[in-house]
Amino acid sequence: EPTMYGEILSPNYPQAYPSEVEKSWDIEVPEGYGIHLYFTHLDIELSENCAYDSVQIISGDTEEGRLCGQRSSNNPHSPIVEEFQVPYNKLQVIFKSDFSNEERFTGFAAYYVATDINECTDFVDVPCSHFCNNFIGGYFCSCPPEYFLHDDMKNCGVNCSGDVFTALIGEIASPNYPKPYPENSRCEYQIRLEKGFQVVVTLRREDFDVEAADSAGNCLDSLVFVAGDRQFGPYCGHGFPGPLNIETKSNALDIIFQTDLTGQKKGWKLRYHGDPMPCPKEDTPNSVWEPAKAKYVFRDVVQITCLDGFEVVEGRVGATSFYSTCQSNGKWSNSKLKCQPVDCGIPESIENGKVEDPESTLFGSVIRYTCEEPYYYMENGGGGEYHCAGNGSWVNEVLGPELPKCVPVCGVPREPFEEKQRIIGGSDADIKNFPWQVFFDNPWAGGALINEYWVLTAAHVVEGNREPTMYVGSTSVQTSRLAKSKMLTPEHVFIHPGWKLLEVPEGRTNFDNDIALVRLKDPVKMGPTVSPICLPGTSSDYNLMDGDLGLISGWGRTEKRDRAVRLKAARLPVAPLRKCKEVKVEKPTADAEAYVFTPNMICAGGEKGMDSCKGDSGGAFAVQDPNDKTKFYAAGLVSWGPQCGTYGLYTRVKNYVDWIMKTMQENSTPRED
């Protein structure tokens, strides 16, 4: 426990002290006091530097003194032979004796007392920034007028913090400006403006004089601006070193002025004002801003319109423009929205054609549609090339957004028919020679495919069976082969209105208008064994002349059997109608004169016994197109004949083209796109 005074005596004092002793005393007086230590008796073996025996006085790490020998007081009125004054409240006294003493030494007697110290004057480091006041056992600091004592109770500063500026314009200066600013102060000023306005600070170079930086470049006194997570400064020196106009991009600004104890200058003065928060003129690619301005500020609204071929995609909805507002935080609303290239998407597939997978489906990309050649061609032109247009559609120069239509190529057999030997008198044929040939199994007959949905045949073939079963693509009509071929299902049968329906068809003598159309339920897929025959044109080029050659095909009666198993065909010349009239009817069901011959009939055959016969009815009499030798058209349909192996009569298809076209148009189903 600290004491105010005390006595220290060497061992055995006042008797001689023993050899080889080391004894120490720790003196402690209360905090705020120093120690006055004085010796009233000193009798210790003398040696150089008191090396043998000694009394040592230590204050902290400092040796205040080392005593030996004999002393006596210089003052007859005072018993003190040696004294020490320390401004600290702790002291150590150490007594040491060596192994031998040549004489008898009595040691020492010492006393200590607590003494007041003057903290204001006794130390190198002044404890108070301004005024120091000493009292017994301590001191206190005080401040000049308008200063206040900081919490450390040592430093004085000015009360320059706490001001909040909310006006849109104002002026702030350091304390006492332009007189020197207070030392050892931290001044904080707050500017708080309405959201959407940024604080802009303006200074003049001459309005700034703050203690300069040290040799390491650190400001001893400093002015700092803090706006959110952005800091401007610290600034110091003679003349403002920073930008004279500081745009803080924030509606809140803290100004911090920190001074140290030395080097006071005149300080600083600044002006501030609130600018509507600017929003950057962002570079939004592929778009136009309306209105266009050099600078945009809080509450400005712009319409951002995408250039042609670009769109704003938000969710699943595409738009060509959007509005953006300059917000209070200096950021644009809808800033995530961008003008992206229009995506036309995966192009639609087309029937009987294809489009190669595009590398890109974005604006400006090009795709090409092609038809499944050689069985289909592009009917509506345009070349099949489409580009991704600005409106998000695939567009063709000719057709616009309309898709190309792949329609069957007509009248082109994959393999030409060659007569191999001398249908009656005909040759074996392959379905590839006559891909338009349709087989009807009840009654056993033929027909001609004229497009994906329509079969042309003779009226007498379908008059007794309005739901005929038809097959395409097979050379053989064996049940096993037909099972593997394409069966066509009828939707409706259209018999020519001029065809006379009889109660007993077997007795028919009038085959005028022997033509019918069968509308199919489903479109036929074309290929090497299935492909339509062309219809005749309406020009005079398609008027047949005697001797013109045509091909007939079918599975009808041959010389060898009543029904052909494999397709037969023959090449026949057109003959004058009278040649047909002259032939005697083989099994007449009526008087020979009763048989009707009209201009709607073509007579053909009569050469080498080549003729159509029972079971060939409805098949095409195919003639080379006069305007395109690669194609065949249906000039006639097998209708009737007086006698197999002579001349046969064929319905003249040219006379019915208008009826065929009209019937097909009126009964076409709109394509389900």
Epitope: N442, Y471, V477, T479, S480, R563
Partner: antibody, heavy 125, light 107 residues
Framework: EVQLVESGGGVVRPGGSLRLSCAAS????????MSWVRQAPGKGLEWVSG????????GYADSVKGRFTISRDNAKNSLYLQMNSLRAEDTALYYC??????????????????WGKGTTVTVSS | DIQMTQSPSSLSASVGDRVTITCRAS??????LGWYQQKPGKAPKRLIY???NLQSGVPSRFSGSGSGTEFTLTISSLQPEDFATYYC?????????FGGGTKVEIK
């Protein structure tokens, strides 16, 4: 050359079984229907059974129904007649014959245009 | 079942004779009928199909006619190789049925 060759005939006790085979060559077997016809010694012809080109349709004479089974293996160009529960009256010369079937949904049969030489089946105790 | 009745069951004729064999169906069979020739120890051979169509390779002296229930096979001029047994076959419906046969012998 179109040819049909029967085999598998022989002597069997009543109640026994036999399997006749008919090997076809010289034509596309799976394009034709096939028939079995038998002829008892000194008697006329009797149609026994028939099968269409792909084996999906069969027919039998009343006298063999439930006892005989006709089948075909198009991959092997072969026709078969499995005869079970044989009776003495099944003793006969068994022919296989080719049937032509034309047309699709509505078809036309041309039966037995080609015949084999036959194989003899004797049912005796 | 459709019964086929053939007549006569046998006949004697001379070379060069015109021979007619008849087959009657118990119900109408349209023209679904064939005629077969069988010689002793041989397999039958088709002569006519669909009542009137001559099988390829068969001499034209053979002809068939009829429809419905009455059918006829005619040999216009009998030849030595024509002596055989003749059968008709109906294939209108299952079970197929043969006629009892007509044996043509040398007179």
């Amino acid at each position: 050359e179109v040819q049909l060759v029967e085999s598998g005939g022989g002597v069997v006790r009543p109640g026994g079984s036999l399997r006749l085979s008919c090997a076809a060559s010289g034509f596309t077997f799976d394009d034709y229907g096939m028939s079995w016809v038998r002829q008892a010694p000194g008697k006329g012809l009797e149609w026994v059974s028939g099968i269409n080109w792909e084996g999906g349709s069969t027919g039998y004479a009343d006298s063999v129904k439930g006892r005989f089974t006709i089948s075909r293996d198009n991959a092997k160009n072969s026709l078969y007649l499995q005869m079970n529960s044989l009776r003495a009256e099944d003793t006969a010369l068994y022919y296989c014959a080719r049937d032509e079937q034309l047309g699709g949904k509505y078809y036309y049969y041309y039966y037995m245009d080609v015949w084999g030489k036959g194989t003899t089946v004797t049912v005796s105790s | 079942d459709i019964q086929m009745t053939q007549s006569p069951s046998s006949l004697s004729a001379s070379v060069g004779d015109r021979v007619t064999i008849t087959c009657r169906a118990s119900q109408g069979i349209r023209n679904d009928l064939g005629w077969y020739q069988q010689k002793p120890g041989k397999a039958p051979k088709r002569l006519i199909y669909t009542a009137s169509n001559l099988q390829s390779g068969v001499p034209s002296r053979f002809s068939g006619s009829g429809s419905g229930t009455e059918f006829t096979l005619t040999i216009s001029s009998l030849q030595p190789e024509d002596f055989a047994t003749y059968y008709c076959l109906q294939y209108r419906s299952h079970p197929l049925t043969f006629g009892g046969g007509t044996k043509v012998e040398i007179k």
